[in-house]
């Protein structure tokens, strides 16, 4: 859901030739198309196994998709003078698996970053920080789209993949001023703990097509601009009262819970009650039981308590299978 | 040659609903953000919203926010802005407006002639 | 939200003066400020994008410069078609905005 960057027939892409001379400030890269008139460089599926060191000056839109850069180190676009203007850097199907502390140091415009559809293997805590200081300087990034970066299971780090992305994100309290975090498509089991409460500007978080099983440890209490949250395609099975009262507290925010394996057991009845009555959740009609068997399909909406029931648990001695 | 043009203003009574429209030509739709700006009779400009080209993100000035729904139809080239629970300040002339680059990047390069939405009892 | 602040609210020159009119963001934005010219019943037309950058068909007269606050649109020498109202918008910002306008009369 990123931002679209747009070529214009007015204005063609130049496709750059390699040349000896020593590069000047407003040349095309080599294997790159460049158009001056919209701010725009894409160096797209070229194989490129490392950043471009001439990027013109006047770059606000930079495309790096489809390549081979395996590392972004330290300082990968610092340049002297610095790319002052780059506000929107796309790094997505770079087969990029590590991305290390200060990568993105020396942007002082950066305002949205996508580093979707990459296996990233390491991604340093200090990726978005730049330093180790418990408080950093403020990234001016607003939004931040990791869909789709977690590594095959044999490139995984030890620690969970969960815990490291989380690491970057609140590293230095340098967020504060996302607006869109998406986290979709990474196979996470369960959000952190303390990952909100270091992002309290978000308007929008994505975190469908995940795992996730639980939101009981979450908490959305400070997220008062939330506009879109998005838990569709996860493994949610009920929303506890703690949940819903603070997603009902969010001023602005709509909620979308679709395809979800809910469990239509006695657990379930605050959250029916609660959805039966918030404006909240966006296409509640079409939630549906999962488990048990003879709740699947049924609509949680038309349910009532006496449906919600659960089967009493039967001492050892009595249980058959 | 790119044209942009607005439709669907009228008279509205404060509380009410009206979708506005903006039929785009001239150029490919789908790979431009694009926005809405409004002008109260005698005002200064207001930007109202903005959505990227494939329609994944949307922005809303505080003002209109959880009232306004921008939205597009790539296959129809047009461009949405649903406006509920109207106000009298939402009186305006609704201009809607191509942006040339990406949306933190860009300016507004073509714009339409604008579009009366009058919100009154 | 970032604010922007144009000055003066309104002037008047006469053909063949330079004119400039400035406009102040309430936080640094780089270059991304753009500039507009509304004439009566008209919808607003781009003249200057990228702080100083002249868009296309727009008369080399106009100029823009300026980064981080503060910023300035310049018309070497004024032209009886460049009485309009003149609006500076800031793009850095999650959420853009429009300066309030500058109003320029011909004398």
């Known amino acids: 859901t990123s931002s679209a960057s747009s070529s214009s027939s007015s204005a063609p892409f130049l496709a750059s030739a390699a040349s000896a001379q020593p590069p000047l400030p407003d040349q095309c890269p080599a294997l790159c198309e460049c158009s001056e008139a919209a701010r725009t460089v894409k160096c797209v599926n070229r194989n490129l196994t490392e950043v471009p060191t001439d990027l013109p000056l006047y770059v606000r839109n930079l495309f790096l998709t489809g390549n081979q850069l395996a590392v972004l180190p330290a300082g990968a676009f610092a340049r002297r003078p610095p790319l002052a203007e780059l506000a929107a850097l796309n790094l997505s199907g770079s087969r990029l698996d590590e991305v290390r502390g200060g990568a993105f140091e020396h942007l002082p415009s950066l305002r949205q970053l996508d580093l979707s559809h990459n296996p990233l293997a390491y991604l340093s805590p200090f990726a978005f920080s730049g330093s180790n200081a418990s408080i950093s300087a403020p990234s001016p990034l607003v939004e931040l789209i990791l869909n789709h970066i977690v590594p095959p299971d044999d490139k995984r780090q030890n620690r969970s993949f969960e815990g490291m992305v989380a690491a970057a994100l609140v590293a230095g309290r340098a967020l504060q001023g996302l607006h869109l975090l998406e986290l979709a498509s990474n196979h996470f089991l369960y959000l952190p703990r303390d990952v909100l409460a270091q992002l309290p500007s978000l308007r929008y978080l994505d975190l469908s097509n995940n795992s996730l099983v639980s939101l009981t440890y979450v908490s959305f209490r400070n997220l008062t601009h939330l506009e879109s949250l998005h838990l569709e395609d996860n493994a949610l099975k009920v929303l506890h009262n703690g949940t819903l009262a603070e997603l009902q507290g969010l001023p602005h925010v709509r909620v979308f819970l679709d395809n979800n394996p809910w469990v239509c057991d006695c657990h379930m009845a605050d959250m029916v009650t609660w959805l039966k009555q918030t404006g909240v959740v966006q296409g509640k009609d079409r939630l549906t039981c999962a488990f048990p068997e003879k709740m699947r399909n049924r609509v949680l909406l038309e349910l009532n308590s006496a449906d919600l029931d659960c089967d009493p648990i039967l001492p050892p001695s009595l249980q058959t299978s | 040659e790119v044209q942009l043009l607005e439709s669907g203003g009228g008279l509205v009574q404060p509380g009410g609903s009206l979708r506005l429209s903006c039929a785009a030509s001239?150029?490919?739709?789908?790979?431009?953000?694009m926005s809405w700006v409004r002008q109260a009779p005698g005002k200064c400009l207001e930007w109202v919203s903005a959505?990227?080209?494939?329609?994944?993100?949307?922005y809303y000035a505080d003002s209109v926010k959880g009232r306004f729904t921008i939205s597009r139809d790539n296959s129809k080239n047009t461009l949405y802005l649903q406006m509920n629970s109207l106000r009298a300040e939402d009186t305006a002339v609704y201009y809607c407006?191509?942006?040339?680059?990406?949306?933190?990047?860009?300016?507004?390069?073509?714009w339409g002639q604008g579009t009366l939405v009058t919100v009154s009892s | 939200d970032i604010q922007m602040t144009q000055s003066p609210s309104s002037l008047s020159a006469s053909v063949g003066d330079r004119v400039t009119i400035t406009c102040r963001a309430s936080?640094?934005?780089?270059?991304?400020l753009n500039w507009y010219q509304q004439k009566p019943g008209k919808a607003p037309k781009l003249l200057i994008y990228?702080?100083?950058s002249l868009q296309s068909g727009v008369p080399s007269r106009f100029s823009g410069s300026g980064s981080g606050t503060d910023f300035t649109l310049t018309i070497s020498s004024l032209q009886p078609e460049d009485s309009a109202t003149y609006y500076c918008?800031?793009?850095?910002?999650?959420?853009?905005?429009f300066g309030c306008g500058t109003k320029l009369e011909i004398k």
């Open positions: 407006a191509r942006y040339y680059g990406g949306y933190y990047s860009a300016w507004m390069d073509y």
């Open positions: 001239g150029f490919t739709f789908s790979s431009y953000a």
């Open positions: 959505i990227s080209g494939s329609g994944g993100s949307t």
């Open positions: 936080q640094s934005i780089s270059s991304f």
């Open positions: 990228a702080a100083s």
């Open positions: 918008q800031q793009t850095y910002g999650y959420l853009h905005t």
